[in-house]
């Protein structure tokens, strides 16, 4: 009932809670004395349901049958209508429209950790729209029961807030939960377990890891956990990898070596408990443990190339390149490379320690047979060094493998070509394809770039240190014991046509004809490998198509002489420079008169 | 100083009830687990009914459904409510109280560290 009621009551049969699709009566009724003044038969008692009328009236009373009522609750209010008066109040009820319970199903009951408390979990089923009271029990051993009701208004959780203790392991005990409300009850099917089964164990903690003189090999991993923990299982991985490694051991007692760890590698480690061999669940993983192991001496052989530049009649510098080792060849941080420079014959040697770079340069004499051997070291040890004899690379022209084609395959690829040499093909034993920016000066301190490819390929797809719009020299050798044969040609990946034409900066007149002399276009502007150079020329003020001179582009060329001028005529002169995409826009003008005879 | 005073005993016939109270000083019930035993002439003392701090009763199954036991936080006092009596639940009642968080510490005597007096209950068929 709402409000005072005081003039009148508002009853409601069978109950102010129904089930879903039941029909109530409504009563209202007035109290003696309490109709409208003097004309108690013009009473209008009205009903309505929340704001809207569905039924009146006139006389002390008014009977209502309502069906269709939604779930939920449903406010009801009587009033009364007096003639010249506003409506006066007299009572109202609320009606609780639900259904019975479902039987709670799935019922399962978890203890984390042997400390942990039991909490157990449940599905109610639809919502009843009532209030609605759950009771948690649980039967166990020596004819004991525990309960435990439920608050909530929306009850599938309940913990019980104590502990399960580990006395009697496989001793039985049976959960069940009951849901209650005025229409009805039902429990769920019972659930019957042991402590091994639902202690879920908390995840190990304190995990520490040692290794043994240093050693990758002797790997201990240490942790603890709780008393009861028969079964552990532990996985890793390096920290850089996805996939995991995993272990299962027994009757641990918190530590297990591990015997597959690679040197200088930063692992991952995690482990998880259980209390029995088949019965409850495994913990959550325990948190991450990252651990480096330690160092051990370099695997694998460094790979090692060289470059050979003549410099007077008696030296000549020597630059060797190495490429670094893989991180598992490495197996720890490099801290300085050992190279060894020695004369075959005379025996002499000379060793250096290279930190902080992958190449050396020394000058030698032109005589005498050299030879070289460099190692990596770590802080374990060195790597077997790679041994190289010096020698003439390019000195066997029957070796020099042929039609060699450099074509630009994708985005910063470039894919050499090249057919084996002359000379038995069958001596080659190893290609070396070899590639630098080209730099017209022909600078030495270009980083260098190869790749080795095996005797029985004629191709190479070369993508390192490969950028667009830039010319590489590439230089493919075939290496056959003690003698070495090359070919070289110009490649780029990526082309269009150079950005300027190059600079005239001076015109000599020489024996009646003239040479033109040029800079090179700086190399960021040339956009590609140059194949020619134009040079145009025409009369002052004539409006004539100028003539053209087409240069094939070699590096070190800067000068070409013109000899079809006339003398004592002022001619216009300017340059371009093509690459396979196109010709640039034309460098500077130059007027020239050349003051010789006429012919 | 930890007091535990039981009150509500008397004779009663059988199938009669009793409400049984026990008022706690110098311990908040709400902390503790409150238990209630029994010990009948020439017998030993045998569990009756229990509270854990956080709500959960337990009961021995021959006496569920005839007794209840409940807390009153704001009176700091423990209840045991007796229906129908039979003459076998002749005995001193005593109130107990204890820092016990698992689940068969709350039917074990040595796990209660404090203890009323007793408050006795006789029914006569």
């Known amino acids: 009932k709402i409000d005072a009621c005081k003039r009148g009551d508002v009853t409601v049969k069978p109950s102010h809670v129904i089930l879903l699709g039941s029909t109530v009566n409504i009563t209202c009724s007035l109290k003696p004395r309490q109709g409208c003044f003097h004309y108690s038969r013009r009473n209008k008692l009205i009903l309505y349901k929340f704001d809207r009328r569905i039924n009146f009236h006139h006389g002390h009373s008014l009977n209502s049958q309502v069906t269709g009522l939604p779930l939920g609750t449903t406010l009801f209010v009587c009033k009364l209508a007096c003639i010249n008066s506003d409506e006066i109040q007299i009572c109202g009820a609320e009606i609780f429209v639900g259904v019975a319970p479902e039987q709670p199903q799935n019922l399962s009951c978890i203890q984390k950790g042997e400390q942990g408390t039991v909490a157990c979990t449940w599905e109610r089923g639809r919502d009843t729209h009532l209030y609605t009271e759950y009771t948690l029990q649980l039967s166990g051993p020596k004819n004991l029961t525990w309960q435990k009701q439920c608050k909530d208004i929306y009850c599938d959780y309940l913990d019980f807030g104590i502990n399960l203790t580990p006395e009697s392991p496989e001793s039985n005990f049976t959960a069940k939960v009951t849901a209650v409300n005025s229409l009805g009850s039902s429990s769920s099917l019972p659930s019957t377990f042991t402590f091994l089964d639902i202690v879920r164990p908390l995840p190990p903690w304190d995990i520490r890891i040692k290794f043994q003189k240093a050693s990758v090999s002797r790997c201990t991993l240490y942790w603890r956990d709780e008393g009861l923990v028969l079964l552990n299982r532990l996985r890793y991985r390096p920290s850089n990898s996805r996939l995991w490694n995993m272990v299962n051991v027994t009757k641990a007692k918190g530590r297990h070596d591990l015997l597959d760890l690679k040197p200088f590698t930063e692992y991952e480690f995690q482990i998880s408990s259980k209390l029995h061999l088949y019965k409850g669940s495994w913990s959550d993983w325990s948190e991450s443990l990252r651990a480096q192991t330690p160092e051990e001496e370099p695997t694998g052989m460094l790979d090692v190339w060289y470059m050979k530049r003549h410099i007077d009649y008696s030296r000549q510098q020597i630059s060797l390149f190495w490429k670094n080792l893989s991180v598992s060849e490495a197996r720890g941080k490099i801290l300085h490379y050992q190279v060894t420079l020695q004369e075959l014959t005379g025996g002499k040697a000379m060793t250096q320690n290279i930190t902080g770079h992958t190449s050396w340069t020394t000058v030698i004499p032109r005589t005498g047979n050299w030879a070289v051997a460099v190692s990596a070291a770590n802080s374990k040890g060195s790597s077997l060094p790679t041994r190289i004899n010096i020698m003439n690379l390019c000195e066997a022209g029957l070796l020099a493998p042929r039609q060699v084609s450099a074509n630009s395959e994708g985005m910063d690829n470039i894919l050499v070509t090249w057919q084996p040499p002359r000379k038995d093909p069958s001596a080659v034993q190893e290609y070396v394809v070899e590639w630098r920016e080209l730099h017209p000066g022909g600078d030495t301190q270009v980083p260098l770039n190869w790749l080795r490819s095996r005797p029985y390929n004629v191709s190479a797809l070369i993508s390192e240190n490969i950028k667009s719009y830039i010319c590489y020299e590439i230089r493919v050798y075939a290496l056959s014991g003690d003698q070495g044969g090359c070919s070289s040609i110009l490649g780029n990946s990526k082309h269009k046509a150079p950005l300027s034409g190059p600079h005239i900066n001076a015109i000599t007149e020489e024996k009646g004809s003239i040479l033109i002399s040029w800079n090179s276009i700086p190399v960021q502007e040339q956009m590609g490998c140059l194949l020619h150079y134009r040079i145009y020329w025409k009369e002052r003020d004539s409006n004539s198509q100028p003539q053209l001179c087409e240069i094939p582009y070699r590096v070190s060329q800067n000068s070409h002489p013109i000899n079809s001028l006339q003398p004592r005529v002022t001619y216009v002169l300017w340059m371009t420079a093509l690459t396979a995409a196109g010709e640039s826009s034309h460098g500077n003008e130059r007027e020239f008169c050349l003051q010789g005879k006429a012919n | 100083q930890v007091q535990l005073q039981e009150s509500g005993g008397g004779s009663v016939q059988a199938g009669g009830s009793l409400r049984l109270s026990c008022a706690v000083s110098?311990?908040?019930?709400?902390?503790?687990?409150m238990g209630w035993f029994r010990q009948a002439p020439g017998k030993e003392r045998e569990f009756v009914a229990a509270?854990?701090?956080?709500?959960?009763?337990v009961y021995p199954n021959s006496m569920k459904g005839r007794i209840t036991i409940s807390r009153d936080n704001a009176k700091n006092a423990v209840y045991l409510q007796l229906n129908a009596l039979k003459p076998e639940d002749t005995a001193v009642y005593y109130c107990?109280?204890?820092?016990?968080?698992?689940?068969?510490?709350?039917?074990?005597?040595?796990?209660?560290?404090?203890w009323g007096q007793g408050t006795q209950v006789t029914v006569s068929s």
């Open positions: 107990s109280m204890g820092p016990i968080a698992t689940f068969q510490g709350l039917a074990r005597q040595n796990e209660y560290h404090y």
């Open positions: 110098g311990r908040t019930v709400s902390d503790y687990a």
């Open positions: 509270m854990s701090s956080s709500e959960t009763t």
